[in-house]
Interface confidence: low
Amino acid sequence: VSITKCSSDMNGYCLHGQCIYLVDMSQNYCRCEVGYTGVRCEHFFL
């Protein structure tokens, strides 16, 4: 799967993680920091 950095328009989309753009799927995706989950890495879990 080809990935690249999200456009600047998506700044702030991922609350606790890095936004990556899945080129083949034309979708933005949040790569969450450790301890976070959710579409925007909005949920913390232990």
């Epitope: 328009d9 700044n11 702030g12 909005e42 913390f44």
Partner: antibody, heavy 124, light 107 residues
Framework: HLQLQESGPGLVKSSETLSLTCSVS??????????WGWIRQPPGKGLEWIGS???????YYNPSLKSRVTISADTSKSQYSLKLSSVTAADTAVYYC????????????????WGNGTTVTVSS | DIQMTQSPSSLSASVGDSVTITCRAS??????LNWYQKKPGKAPKVLIY???SLQSGVPSRFSGSGSGTDFTLTISSLQPEDFATYYC?????????FGQGTRLEIK
């Protein structure tokens, strides 16, 4: 300076759709770094967030209202709108539009610019 | 959703007093907490964002503190224009929620 102004009918019949528009002057809703939202305050009650959108397409809604709410934008007119379907008396409130800034490093989403609010009454 | 609970619901104070309003989140929200002042017939006004950052143009007698689940808004040396209703608001998750409000009245 930036100003927001809500407009729409002050009276809506029960079971019908409430439609409001927020007109933005002195700025653009397609400016990078800002979300644009709707908040309401029922009589004698607290503030309730309805939903917000970012011009590039991200739109978020209050889960308790999600099935009835649509927020859309007309960037050419620098306006955005709220549609709330199947209204009841519980939807009677003052409705505000507001801007909330964000950036990559923080996501505090505090509403820094508000409209004056418009009162909507749902009648049976 | 994250529930925000403010206390007290109302309080009375005099001009010159110092008052503290508390906001508690139902789960940890780091410092994703904002405070607003609301007067009847007027739009809310942001006072504090990120738990402790003073919004531009807001008098320094307003201050915020806290992290995790417990937060406070302190108003030192109350002025006549400070009597209003105050709301906390979290933005830790996509679904923004407000506290129920604290009404500050003149004693």
């Amino acid at each position: 300076h930036l100003q927001l102004q809500e407009s729409g009918p002050g009276l809506v019949k029960s079971s019908e759709t409430l439609s409001l528009t927020c007109s933005v002057s002195g700025g653009s809703i397609s400016s990078s770094g800002y979300y644009w939202g709707w908040i309401r305050q029922p009589p004698g009650k607290g503030l309730e967030w309805i939903g917000s959108f970012y011009y590039s397409g991200n739109t978020y809604y209050n889960p308790s209202l999600k099935s009835r709410v649509t927020i859309s934008a007309d960037t050419s007119k620098s306006q955005y709108s709220l549609k709330l379907s199947s209204v009841t008396a519980a939807d009677t409130a003052v409705y505000y539009c507001a801007r909330h800034p964000f950036n990559w490093n923080d996501h505090y989403h505090y509403m820094d610019v508000w409209g004056n609010g418009t009162t909507v009454t749902v009648s049976s | 959703d994250i529930q925000m609970t403010q206390s007290p619901s109302s309080l009375s104070a005099s001009v010159g007093d110092s008052v503290t309003i508390t906001c508690r989140a139902s789960q940890s929200i780091s410092n994703y907490l904002n405070w607003y002042q609301k007067k009847p017939g007027k739009a809310p006004k942001v006072l504090i964002y990120a738990a402790s950052s003073l919004q531009s143009g807001v008098p320094s007698r307003f201050s915020g503190s806290g992290s995790g689940t417990d937060f406070t808004l302190t108003i030192s040396s109350l002025q006549p224009e400070d009597f209003a209703t105050y709301y906390c608001q979290q933005s830790y998750i996509t679904s923004i929620t407000f506290g129920q409000g604290t009404r500050l009245e003149i004693k």
